[in-house]
């Protein structure tokens, strides 16, 4: 994956009088790129799914969660090389016999058209054009995400 990167910085707003602040990410850090309300980090190197999951976690982020087909397409547009696969935060739950996002929700069958089998030790990868079921032990690249947060929430005293 090779795409231009916006140089952004993390800027946590200071609390001010009559304002409650929720510390969070207001801009994307360097090496991360913004896609709508998310910052995405496309790895350069390869790992199995579990290590990719752990890497995102240590970066105070998560493997990519895709809300709908529209977000999938916009993410795929950031992938320059057709041949490269990236892990996302979706794997097969054997106990529930369904695709499960790492946030605990299940895949809406209309969201992604997955190529490959839904079976034990299967994890989901995306390429520039498709979505694939792969053995979770396969070493490929991965995408981490951080959510951008609103700048501030104003709280006004009672009248």
């Amino acid at each position: 994956q090779k795409s231009s990167i916006e140089k952004c910085s993390v800027d946590i707003q200071q609390s001010r009088n009559k304002t409650t602040e929720r510390p969070g990410l207001l801009n994307c850090p360097i090496y991360w790129q913004q896609l709508r309300e998310k910052c995405l980090l496309f790895s350069h190197t390869v790992n199995p799914w579990n290590n990719s999951l752990a890497d995102c976690s240590t970066k105070e982020s998560s493997l990519l969660l895709i809300r709908d087909k529209d977000e999938l397409i916009h993410t795929q547009n950031l992938i320059r090389d057709k041949a490269i696969l990236f892990w996302i935060g979706l794997n097969f739950s054997l106990s529930e016999k369904n695709w499960k996002w790492i946030n605990g929700s299940f895949l809406n069958s209309n969201d992604l058209e997955i190529r490959g089998d839904a079976k034990e030790n299967s994890c989901i990868s995306i390429s520039q054009t498709s979505v694939y079921s792969e053995y979770c032990s396969t070493e490929i690249r991965w995408i981490c995400q951080k959510e951008l947060t609103p700048v501030r929430n104003k709280v006004y005293p009672d009248s």
Epitope: H44, T45, K59
Partner: antibody
Amino acid sequence: EVQLVESGGGLVQPGGSLRLSCAASGFTFSTYDMHWVRQVTGKGLEWVSTIGTAGDTKYSGSVKGRFTISRENAKNSLYLQMHSLRVGDTAVYYCTRAPVGAISDYWGQGTLVTVSS
Amino acid sequence: NFMLTQPHSVSESPGKTVTISCTRSSGSIASNYVQWYQQRPGNSPTIVIYEDNQRPSGVPDRFSGSIDSSSNSASLTISGLKTEDEADYYCQSYDSINHVVFGGGTKLTVL
């Protein structure tokens, strides 16, 4: 301010062992991959080893089986345990911070390892 | 594994433009990002270009990077050469199993 400070270099005989350390400060150490890179005086840079945030490790062919990279996040420290040292391992050893992939955006000042009888 | 080959040395006058090449021996230059590092005498390397053509903050815009698939090479171009640019320059990439690869280095002399 990001700082990487290597230590532990010195003179050792062929076949001997040495442990290098890299003290990191000014950033959240646990969220970064880390590399060791070495340089023979007057020569080019040579990658030695990488440790990922998940603890996964990689080694160059020339050191695999002899060197072990490790990290201690609680101490913001990176290590390189070197065994069966050879004359050809003589070099300045740098630790570097890797925000993503091979990128080394900060380098330490280096520590000199001399293997000689 | 592949190699990255750089010219041993290049030289140019102040104010001129110089380009340093980095040719990948096998596999596509476009398949993995290329970084460039500057190492002044007696100092540790510093990054001047990452991800083929991105410039870290603090690096002058006189420095630019590119890749050329037809020659399977990456290039570092320095315009408006200054005497302070005199240094060794190294390209760097990585292979399919996460091994980092450095070029042999190019000594830039500003005449």
